[in-house]
């Protein structure tokens, strides 16, 4: 399960982005039918996202961000104004709405931070790429929620449990997108900030940062270690490659339903392998 992120090939948002469509699981409802108020809200937001992409596709690159934001803003505002239940009950109509509102807020803030300071053309790409991925994560969590009644849901995932790793995949993509748009000297800082924000957003605040997920923290540390003694201009690339491989390994471990300890071991081994490959590719420097 390769993460499919290619920093050298920027995405073309107008044509390529497919925002999440949170179809409920087959046993919960007919495909594509939202079953909860929260799913209805995210469906409306996704519809607005698509409409905004279409609007932005028809304008000059320098005007894309402004056009997207204006169109998506009206749609998002309308989605919140209409529901949940069409009542003006503020940010915390219910505990589930409060959680969704916080996730969406974090997603919008992250997209804005990612795009901040970029040229108008790059701003659009960064904002849409980040928001697209964040909406996909949020919609994914709502699909899971549709399977069980809210009362049966585990509110906070205990640290070390593997089901959070699927969200790490997406958080990594968001952070990598942000970092690759940043100046060379800021890439690590931007990556770490965006990675933490995305993890926090996708887990509804259950995890404040990657450091709260032991397996992931170990992987990040090893990925950083892989960059020691590498040339400055490739340090970030080495780090990203190593961490990407580690997260891929974690995902595979999760699919195979291995325990957390095994996943950590797999991730550690993967980082080691990636380190070897990366250092070989950059002139054989090794710690």
């Amino acid at each position: 399960a390769d993460l499919g992120y290619g920093p050298a090939t920027p995405a073309a948002p107008a044509a390529g982005y497919t925002p999440a469509t949170p179809a409920a699981p087959a046993e919960a409802a007919p495909a594509g039918k939202a079953t909860t108020e929260e799913q209805k809200l995210i469906e409306k937001i996704n519809a607005g996202f698509k409409a905004a992409l279409a609007a932005a596709a028809g304008v000059q690159p320098a005007d894309k961000y402004r056009t997207f934001v204006a169109t998506f803003g009206a749609a998002s505002n309308k989605a919140f104004a209409e529901g949940l239940s069409g009542e003006p009950k503020g940010a915390a109509e219910s505990s589930s709405k409060a959680a969704l509102t916080s996730k969406l807020d974090a997603a919008y803030k992250l997209a804005y931070k990612t795009a901040e300071g970029a040229t108008p053309e790059a701003k659009y790409d960064a904002y849409v790429a980040t928001l697209s991925e964040a909406l996909r994560i949020i919609a994914g969590t709502l699909e899971v929620h549709a399977v069980k009644p809210a009362a049966e849901e585990v509110k906070v995932i205990p640290a070390g449990e593997l089901q959070v790793i699927e969200k790490v995949d997406a958080a990594f993509k968001v952070a990598a997108t942000a970092a690759n748009a940043a100046p060379a000297n800021d890439k690590f800082t931007v990556f770490e900030a965006a990675f933490n924000d995305a993890i926090k957003a996708s887990t509804g605040g259950a995890y404040e940062s990657y450091k709260f997920i032991p397996a992931l923290e170990a992987a990040v540390k090893q990925a950083y270690a892989a960059t020691v003694a590498t040339a400055p201009e490739v340090k970030y690339t080495v780090f990203e490659t190593a961490l990407k491989k580690a997260i891929t390994a974690m995902s595979e471990a999760q699919k195979a339903a291995k325990p957390a300890a095994a996943a950590t071991a797999t991730a550690t081994a993967a980082v080691g392998a990636a380190t070897g490959a990366a250092t070989a590719a950059t002139g054989g420097y090794k710690v």
Epitope: K78, A81, E82, G90, A91, A92, E93, A106, Y108, A111
Partner: antibody
């Protein structure tokens, strides 16, 4: 806003609020009032499609809010006015979202119209 | 219910001024701050407790979550003379604090 003025207790007034330069039919609109020398108090709200209208307890049964999205206007019909209804009435746009995050605030206000209820 | 303190404050140009707003129950970060000058409509300064509204000078900042919030003017300017209101958006109806009047000495 327009429609304010001096009126005797028990009489009626109709306030209007005309909007421009934004997607009017995507926003909830509120009337907020301010008695002389006092703080801000919400009076009434209307949803984007008129399906939901809410009123402060102090005006329930006396005030009616309605909107005309095609003309980008919101109206507040005030009947059976009382002296305590006196003050400046503002229409305000309730915004849930901007590109930096959730907003949940009144981000656009009219200039206000004065209502004086006095015998 | 929202309680602002102090009800009024007098400070000199360049001073740091802090206004607090306390909610009777937790409202997460869904609090906004407004500035109102005499004879004018309120103006949104801060939303979501700490986000600066577009066009508002950076000397204004907001912080807090749960029940305790504050608005800080880092270096008071003559044009900041006004009444400041907090407003909660956690649950309807959206209520305002009673206001804090800021005067220039």
């Amino acid at each position: 806003e327009s429609g304010g003025g001096v009126v005797q207790p028990g009489r009626s007034l109709r306030l209007s609020c005309a909007a421009s330069e934004f997607a009017f039919d995507s926003y909830e609109i509120y009337w907020v009032r301010q008695a002389p020398g006092k703080g801000l108090e919400w009076v009434a709200m209307i949803s984007i499609d008129e399906t939901n209208k809410h009123y402060a307890d102090s005006v329930k049964g006396r005030f009616t809010i309605f909107r005309d999205n095609s003309n980008k206007t919101v109206h507040l019909q005030m009947n059976n006015l009382r002296s305590e209804d006196s003050g400046v009435y503002y229409c305000a746009r309730w915004n849930n979202w901007n590109h930096r995050g959730m907003v949940f605030a009144f981000d656009l206000w009219g200039q206000g119209t004065m209502v004086t209820v006095s015998s | 219910e929202l309680t602002q303190s102090p009800s009024s404050v007098s400070a000199s140009v360049g001073d740091r001024v802090t206004i607090t707003c306390r909610a009777s129950q937790g409202i997460s970060s869904w609090l906004a701050w407004y500035q109102q000058k005499p004879g004018k409509a309120p103006k949104l300064l801060i939303y979501s407790a700490s986000s600066l509204q577009s066009g508002v000078p950076s000397r204004f900042s907001g912080s807090g979550s749960g029940t305790d919030f504050s608005l800080t003017i880092s270096s008071l300017q003559p044009e900041d003379s006004a009444t400041y209101y907090c407003q909660q958006a956690n649950s309807f109806p959206y209520t305002f604090g009673q206001g804090t009047k800021v005067e220039i000495k």
